[in-house]
């Protein structure tokens, strides 16, 4: 008689592992295997399915197969002993739509009172599955002390992230799970990881750390505990925190700011271009270091202040014409400030305290209807016209400039 | 302003060794990595491998894994490219550039490496 | 390894036309790490797009950058004399840093 086809046929799919299940019909025992065969879209004949023939048992693995993980694939399969089953055909599916997300790679590194945790994708550097995708990954992870039941949840994470405020020699276990947002697809958690955070530092890091702009540079500030230290200060592109692995994930150092025995350290603004940066601090006392301080969040656009304009004056007989120009750093360069600014202008005679206000777009203003051979003053300031950044600079030093005579041609 | 400059070129006979070099100057040396770039005869770029003089990570591309070995000294702020035992195929213009964020940003003119018998 | 293929291999036209220069990668590559650059005989590349769009310092904006993923675009608006040179794409999203074959952009 006739071998009955293979029941319940499941295909999964996690990463670029390519994974048949089925279960054997009552009377399929002994001698009995399966064979697959699959069919491609536009193809009319059915191919031998490589790693999924002759098997003895009820799984198999037909990874090696490259196919298109858009394309709908077609699946049959049958029993065969000394006759075979009739084919069974499989319900069909698209590789990428059938995909689950795997469990990303972890590794953990131990501070005192810190975890730092090192991400990488699923599946494996060259994955076909997550070829578009693999920067587009974000993760979830729970984490608990090991001594205890109370998980915490965190969520949106990149593939670098480190974990504060934890106690020294504790021991503390955490899982990870990857998504991708894009695909509405929600991987599955990956095994647990511990690890135990090491002995209390001798040196905390240096807390509180803020930068502000003092005469025309940049100041970076921030509290320590103990006196007699020396400091250094690194930092790093913002955008590469989602990309630990790449190798341009490199702290660097601030010049200005290495070995510096003060809770401060001043570098000029081109040090940075238009961007956003990471800070942190180390501290050191000569035969001990702190770990790094936690990182602050340093964008050139909305932390450093607008800096005042700077205005030529061409004096007329009835009026001044301002040219403003570029503030200038203290190196004398020119500080790009490529948001739309508005300037407010505000002038006097000399001899008077009754100041006039102008607001204008343009760099290029004249102050019309003044009287000839008398000294004004100008100080002008800029304003940001941006929703995001809302800033005014300081007023400018003051500039006086006299009139030309009534009879001064233009 | 920002510099790299290479050492001569050299001519030299299968199965002999070299180190060629590339000084860089005008900014901070070990904030950058440096990277080696073969241009044989008539054809295109071939990026070799890759140095970060800050902690001497050194990652070479798969194909001159063995072939060559990068190296820094960045208390003279210089990348170097070395070979044990040249064959005729490894002449080329070598260039190092400087590289980060933007790419490689700044290049040396090449070192131009003759192998004949 | 990442592959980048560049098409076309040569391409011929006169000056004021406008050029358009492609590159495939063989999997997808952040365009943060992608660039452009030119040489000419006898001189060292020159970098000239850097993050896929970002034009490097001195470059005309004739130059433009595009493109995510796989796929990437450099166009040329205008072409002038000093245009006819290599270009080659590259990627830096991997430290296996791989350039393209070159697409040699020659007068007509």
């Known amino acids: 008689k006739n071998l009955k086809s293979p029941q319940k046929v499941e295909v999964d799919v996690i990463d670029d592992n390519f994974i048949l299940r089925w279960n054997r019909s009552e009377e399929s025992v002994g001698n009995v295997t399966f064979s697959f065969d699959y069919q491609k879209p536009e193809m009319d004949n059915w191919i031998k399915l490589p790693g999924c023939q002759n098997m003895t048992s009820t799984k198999c693995n037909f990874s090696s197969l490259k196919l298109n993980i858009y394309d709908e694939i077609k699946l049959r399969i049958r029993a065969e002993k000394e006759n075979t089953s009739s084919w069974c055909e499989v319900d069909s599916f698209t590789p990428f739509r059938k995909a689950q997300i795997g469990p990303p790679e972890v590794h953990l590194e131990a501070e005192d009172k810190a975890i730092v945790i090192y991400i990488s994708p699923p599946g494996t550097e060259d994955s076909v599955m997550w070829a578009l995708d693999r920067s587009s990954f974000t993760y979830s992870l729970v984490i608990w002390k090991n001594s205890s039941s109370v998980e915490e949840r965190i969520e949106n994470i990149y593939s670098r992230h480190k974990i504060s405020k934890l106690s020294p020699e504790t021991t503390y276990c955490l899982k990870v799970k990857a998504a991708l947002l894009t695909s509405r697809k929600i991987g599955v958690y990956g095994p647990v990881h511990c690890i135990k955070t090491t002995v209390e530092n001798e040196l905390p890091p240096p807390e509180n750390i803020e930068v502000i702009v003092q005469n025309q540079n940049y100041v970076l500030k921030w509290d320590y505990t103990y006196a007699n230290m020396t400091f250094q200060v690194q930092w790093l592109h913002a955008f590469l925190k989602r990309k630990p692995g790449n190798h341009l994930y490199k702290w660097k150092q601030i010049p200005d700011c290495e070995n510096v025995t003060t809770t401060q350290c001043v570098f000029p603004p081109n040090t940075f271009q238009k961007g956003i940066y990471l800070l942190r601090v180390q501290a050191s006392d000569g035969n001990n270091t702190s770990f790094w301080s936690e990182e602050i969040k340093f964008d050139t656009e909305i932390q450093a202040s607008l800096l005042p304009p700077v205005f030529n004056i061409r004096s007329l007989s009835d009026s001044l014409h301002i040219s403003i120009g570029a503030p200038k750093w203290s190196e004398n360069k020119p500080v790009i400030q490529d948001y739309p600014l508005i300037y407010e202008i505000l002038f006097w005679e000399n001899t008077s305290k009754a100041e006039r206000k102008i607001i204008k777009k343009k760099t290029d203003v004249t102050i019309p209807n003044l009287k000839p051979l008398t000294v004004y003053c100008v100080k002008a300031r800029a304003h940001s016209m941006d929703e995001k950044l809302n800033k005014s600079s300081v007023f400018s030093d003051v500039v006086c400039e006299e009139t030309k005579s009534g009879n001064t041609s233009k | 302003e920002v510099q790299l400059v290479q050492s001569g070129a050299e001519v030299k006979k299968p199965g002999e060794s070299l180190k060629i070099s590339c000084k860089g100057s005008?900014?901070?040396?070990?904030?950058?990595?440096i990277a080696w770039v073969r241009q044989m005869p008539g054809k295109g770029l071939e990026s070799m491998g890759i140095?970060?003089?800050?902690?001497?990570?050194?990652r070479y591309s798969p194909s001159f894994q063995g072939q060559v070995t990068i190296s820094a000294d960045k208390s003279i702020t210089t990348a170097y490219l070395q070979w044990s035992s040249l064959k005729a195929s490894d002449t080329a213009m070598y260039y190092c550039?400087?590289?980060?964020?933007?790419?490689?940003?700044?290049w040396g003119r090449g070192t131009l490496v003759t192998v004949s018998s | 390894e990442i592959v980048l293929t560049q098409s076309p291999g040569t391409l011929s036209l006169s000056p004021g036309e406008r050029a358009t220069l492609s590159c495939r990668a063989s999997?997808?590559?952040?365009?943060?790490?992608f660039a452009w650059y030119q040489q000419k005989p006898g001189q060292a590349p020159r970098l000239l797009i850097y993050?896929?769009?970002s034009r490097a310092t001195g470059i005309p904006d004739r130059l433009s950058g595009s493109g995510s993923g796989t796929d990437f675009t450099l166009t040329i608006t205008r072409l002038e004399p000093e245009d006819f040179a290599v270009y080659y794409c590259?990627?830096?999203?991997?430290?296996?840093?791989?350039f393209g074959q070159g697409t040699r952009l020659e007068i007509k």
């Open positions: 550039a400087r590289h980060d964020i933007e790419g490689f940003d700044y």
């Open positions: 005008g900014y901070i040396f070990t904030n950058y990595w």
């Open positions: 140095i970060y003089p800050g902690d001497s990570d050194i």
């Open positions: 999997q997808s590559v952040s365009s943060s790490f």
């Open positions: 993050g896929a769009s």
């Open positions: 590259q990627q830096y999203d991997s430290s296996a840093i791989t």
